[in-house]
Interface confidence: medium
């Protein structure tokens, strides 16, 4: 069998809402994956499990089942959404994310995703991890790859 390639493309959109009383941030983060089947037979994408971490704490998980079948030598782009909650010991972030004197409230999140594919009864898991910028201050739609975290930018004084 040839490889099944999973490429994490990036954050597609992030929709934010707040609970003022609880000082809690709710972020619905939609991510995009490209899954390429390099085989001459179809493979089934059985499930996608994803989690999002902020500051080494898991803030959201998602699982999608029976997603799609990818034909021979074909590629499919799949979007999946992870609902996340930044609260409790991280409620200090509420102040940052809602501070109006900053326009872009970027936080760095670690996106982890595992894709399980099956073919002829055999299953295979492929995992990816990527750090991404997400704006926790407003609803944002990203061009693919735009949210990638490369290095921490130091503000110019």
């Amino acid at each position: 069998p040839r490889s099944i390639d999973v490429k994490y493309i990036g954050v597609k959109s992030a929709y934010v809402s707040y609970d003022v009383q609880k000082r809690t941030i709710y972020l619905n983060i939609t991510n995009t994956l490209n899954i390429t089947n390099n085989n001459y037979y179809s493979v089934e994408v059985e499930n996608i499990t994803a989690q999002v971490q902020f500051s080494k704490t898991v803030i959201g998980k998602a699982r999608l089942n029976n997603i799609t079948i990818i034909g021979p030598l074909d590629m499919k782009q799949i979007d999946y959404t992870v609902p996340t909650v930044i609260a409790e010991e991280m409620s200090y972030m509420y102040d940052f994310c809602t501070l109006i004197s900053i326009k872009v409230h970027n936080i760095v999140l670690m996106m982890q995703v595992t894709v399980t594919t099956t073919y002829f009864g055999h299953s295979e898991q492929i995992s990816q991890e990527r750090y991404q910028y997400v704006d926790c201050g407003r609803n944002t739609t990203y061009q693919l790859g735009q949210s990638e975290y490369l290095n921490v930018l130091q503000p110019q004084q």
Epitope: F96, I100, S101, K103, V104, P155
Partner: antibody, heavy 123, light 112 residues
Framework: QVQLQQPGAELVKPGASVKLSCKAS????????MHWVKQRPGHGLEWIGN????????HYNQNFRGKATLTVDKFSTTAYMHLSSLTSEDSAVYYC????????????????WGQGTSVTVSS | DIVMTQAAPSVPVTPGESVSISCRSS???????????LFWFLQRPGRSPQLLIY???NLASGVPDRFSGSGSGTAFTLRISRVEAEDVGVYYC?????????FGSGTKLEIK
């Protein structure tokens, strides 16, 4: 050096509208919000709203919704405020002022102001 | 909206003396990040407003160190030591913690 240039005066008839300009120079236009402030004769200052020239994101004082519309022209580095359905209450001096934008917390915000445009509404 | 109150419409002062101008806000302007989102402006007669103090206590560029700002979350003071004739004008406080930004009604500095 940083400059915000505004025309000196505008005379308009009641019910008409006017578009005030604020020409920015001497800095990166898209890196600073532009604020607009109203001052009626003998009165204090009233914040109208602001606009981010990089993406035209705006915030308005509720008192000016439907009255003021803020826009920018990035190419000419000019901010505009359109005032509609003018009445004598709109007779005032209108100032533009800049504030650092982007991921920067406001530091020396509103550090440069235009000279103001005096709008007189009279028939 | 946050209401900014400057109780004294005017303050008379003799040149060379010190003067304090006060301002109150209806809500604390102290953010949990440690910054207090208050400005002080001076508007000289027939001129545009000029930034004096930002974030309650920071002196803006080019402003003489005779000016200083202090305060708590809701009560603020602009102090001018050794007042000069050119300090005449109306002093405004302004909050920028929340939209809409709001100004105080102003305090006029008058030379005795």
């Amino acid at each position: 050096q940083v400059q915000l240039q505004q025309p000196g005066a505008e005379l308009v008839k009641p019910g008409a509208s006017v578009k005030l300009s604020c020409k920015a120079s001497g800095y990166t236009f898209t890196s600073y919000w532009m604020h607009w402030v109203k001052q009626r004769p003998g009165h204090g200052l009233e914040w109208i709203g602001n606009i981010d020239p990089s993406d035209s994101d705006t915030h308005y004082n509720q008192n000016f919704r439907g009255k003021a519309t803020l826009t920018v022209d990035k190419f000419s580095t000019t901010a505009y405020m359109h005032l509609s359905s003018l009445t004598s209450e709109d007779s005032a001096v209108y100032y533009c002022a800049r504030s650092r934008g982007g991921t920067y917390d406001y530091g020396e915000a509103m550090d440069y102001w235009g000279q103001g445009t005096s709008v007189t509404v009279s028939s | 909206d946050i209401v900014m109150t400057q109780a004294a419409p005017s303050v008379p002062v003799t040149p060379g003396e010190s003067v304090s101008i006060s301002c109150r806000s209806s809500k604390s302007l102290l953010h949990t990040n440690g910054n207090t989102y208050l400005f002080w402006f001076l508007q000289r007669p027939g001129r545009s407003p000029q930034l004096l103090i930002y974030r309650m206590s920071n002196l803006a560029s080019g402003v003489p160190d005779r000016f200083s700002g202090s305060g708590s979350g809701t009560a603020f003071t602009l102090r001018i030591s050794r007042v000069e004739a050119e300090d005449v004008g109306v002093y405004y406080c302004m909050q920028h913690l929340e939209y809409p930004f709001t100004f105080g009604s102003g305090t006029k500095l008058e030379i005795k």
